[in-house]
Interface confidence: medium
């Protein structure tokens, strides 16, 4: 204000942010600030975060005469104290038939046989624990495995000698190996019977299976 003009401390009001001006002397004033503000003209926001109650990793965000908690994804509520039920929010959180189990600050999956990982998306490598005989090839399946045998070997684990190698089945019969005991099984053509299909049979009988 110039020397020739009349200075009135509260006209216009120097108080900001809704503060009210009170003249305290000929040239002095005082601002009464609204909650959440301070300063000689109420210009400064009071930081409400120093005594915040945000929990579980929540970050305090100052407001005007208040604060909010920015919660990590696993928590919710005013102070991040309420657990988020991920099983409700994400119905497909667990894959391949796994069962979702909500926990404080997270969730877990109970996987069905053959699957593992946080969301049951990883097929367990059953070959890692398989006992296929050396020289055979292990094929991983869901909750199981199979052994692909080299020539001359048979059985679930390729641990048996293949009885069909010696061509025990006669007369063009089909030879199969019993995977449990390694013995040969001859499927005889029409008109033959016996363990190795060497016997003639009466007419009217069809194919015969013989185990040995």
């Amino acid at each position: 204000a110039g020397s020739d003009s009349l200075y009135v401390p509260c006209a216009p009001s120097p108080c900001v942010n809704g503060g009210t001006c009170r003249q305290t002397g000929d040239f002095t004033f005082e601002c009464n600030c609204l909650p959440g503000f301070e300063g000689s003209t109420c210009e400064r926001n009071i930081d409400d975060c120093p005594n915040h109650r945000c929990q579980n990793g929540g970050v305090c965000v100052d407001g005007v005469n208040t604060y909010n908690c920015r919660c990590p994804p696993q928590w919710t509520g005013q102070f991040c104290t309420e657990d988020v039920d991920e099983c409700l929010l994400q119905p497909n959180a667990c894959q391949n038939g796994g069962t979702c189990a909500n926990r404080n600050g997270g969730y877990g999956c109970v996987c069905v046989n053959g699957w593992s990982g946080d969301d049951c998306s990883e097929n367990i490598d059953d070959c890692a624990f398989a006992s296929c005989t050396p020289g055979s090839t292990c094929i991983d399946r869901v909750a199981s495995f199979s052994c692909m045998c080299p020539e001359g070997k048979a059985g679930l684990l390729c641990h048996l000698d293949d009885a069909c190698i010696s061509n025990p089945c006669h007369k063009g019969a089909l030879c199969d190996t019993n995977p449990l005991n390694g013995q040969y099984i001859c499927t005889c053509p029409q008109g033959y019977k016996g363990a190795d299909c060497t016997e003639d049979v009466d007419e009217g009988n069809s194919h015969h299976h013989h185990h040995h």
């Epitope: 005082e30 601002c31 300063g39 000689s40 210009e43 926001n45």
Partner: antibody
Framework: EVQLVESGGGLVQPGGSLKLSCAVS????????MEWIRQASGKGLEWIAA??????????VYSASVKDRFTISRDTSKSTLYLQMNSLKTEDTAVYYC???????????WGQGTLVTVSS | DIQMTQSPSSVSASVGDRVTITCQTS??????LAWYQQKPGKSPKLLIY???RLQDGVPSRFSGSGSGTDYTLTISSLQPEDFATYFC?????????FGGGTKVEIK
């Protein structure tokens, strides 16, 4: 005319104490927030302490770097602002300024500064 | 605490040039920003307060603008006495924080 004049700086050993003064004139001292700011040689400005005005009960706020070591106060009868500095560290070496917070987000008057050197 | 990012850290300019300095804050400070000029061995001098209001006695070639988190100090036509270091400062909440400074040098 608004004036602020600091004094009390000097050389002090680590762990020692020093009290800075800032004599003010030209305005109603009790109506204003007062601040202490420091500046290490060739560096930026760092706010360290404030004392609010009479309307706000002369309450105090400190920066984390000096809390529990420095104390700001004022004597209105002497129109002087003080900064008592205890447990001084080498990193407290700086020029210390007192300033008047004019409201409206600006520090509108500054002293000339006083140099504090903490060294053994 | 509110972080202040001031750029550039230095600028070389000639008399008559237009110089722009920016200051970015880590959160909205609702125009609660001041700009200061400091010359070697001297104390800072308030130029702009409230982001855009010119302090009494400061030449009109200095101007401030901005809102939210982005603020600018502009010197429209650089004068010899303007070669100095400039600082921004937020006064929106304690602790008060300053930008790192911009040194305006002669090209």
């Amino acid at each position: 005319e608004v004036q602020l004049v600091e004094s009390g700086g000097g050389l002090v050993q680590p762990g020692g104490s020093l009290k800075l003064s800032c004599a003010v004139s030209g305005f109603t001292f009790s109506d204003f927030y007062m601040e202490w700011i420091r500046q290490a040689s060739g560096k930026g400005l760092e706010w360290i302490a404030a004392q609010r005005n009479k309307a706000n009960d002369f309450s105090i706020v400190y920066s984390a770097s000096v809390k529990d070591r420095f104390t700001i106060s004022r004597d209105t009868s002497k129109s002087t602002l003080y900064l008592q500095m205890n447990s001084l560290k080498t990193e407290d070496t700086a020029v210390y300024y007192c300033s008047r917070d004019g409201g409206k987000w600006g520090l509108d008057a500054w002293g000339q500064g006083t140099l504090v050197t903490v060294s053994s | 605490d509110i972080q202040m990012t001031q750029s550039p850290s230095s600028v070389s300019a000639s008399v008559g040039d237009r110089v722009t300095i920016t200051c970015q804050t880590s959160e909205d400070i609702y125009s609660g920003l001041a700009w200061y000029q400091q010359k070697p061995g001297k104390s800072p001098k308030l130029l702009i307060y409230g982001a855009s209001r010119l302090q009494d006695g400061v030449p009109s070639r200095f101007s401030g603008s901005g809102s939210g988190t982005d603020y600018t100090l502009t010197i429209s036509s650089l004068q010899p006495e303007d070669f100095a270091t400039y600082f921004c400062q937020q006064g929106f909440k304690y602790p008060l924080t300053f930008g790192g400074g911009t040194k305006v040098e002669i090209k």
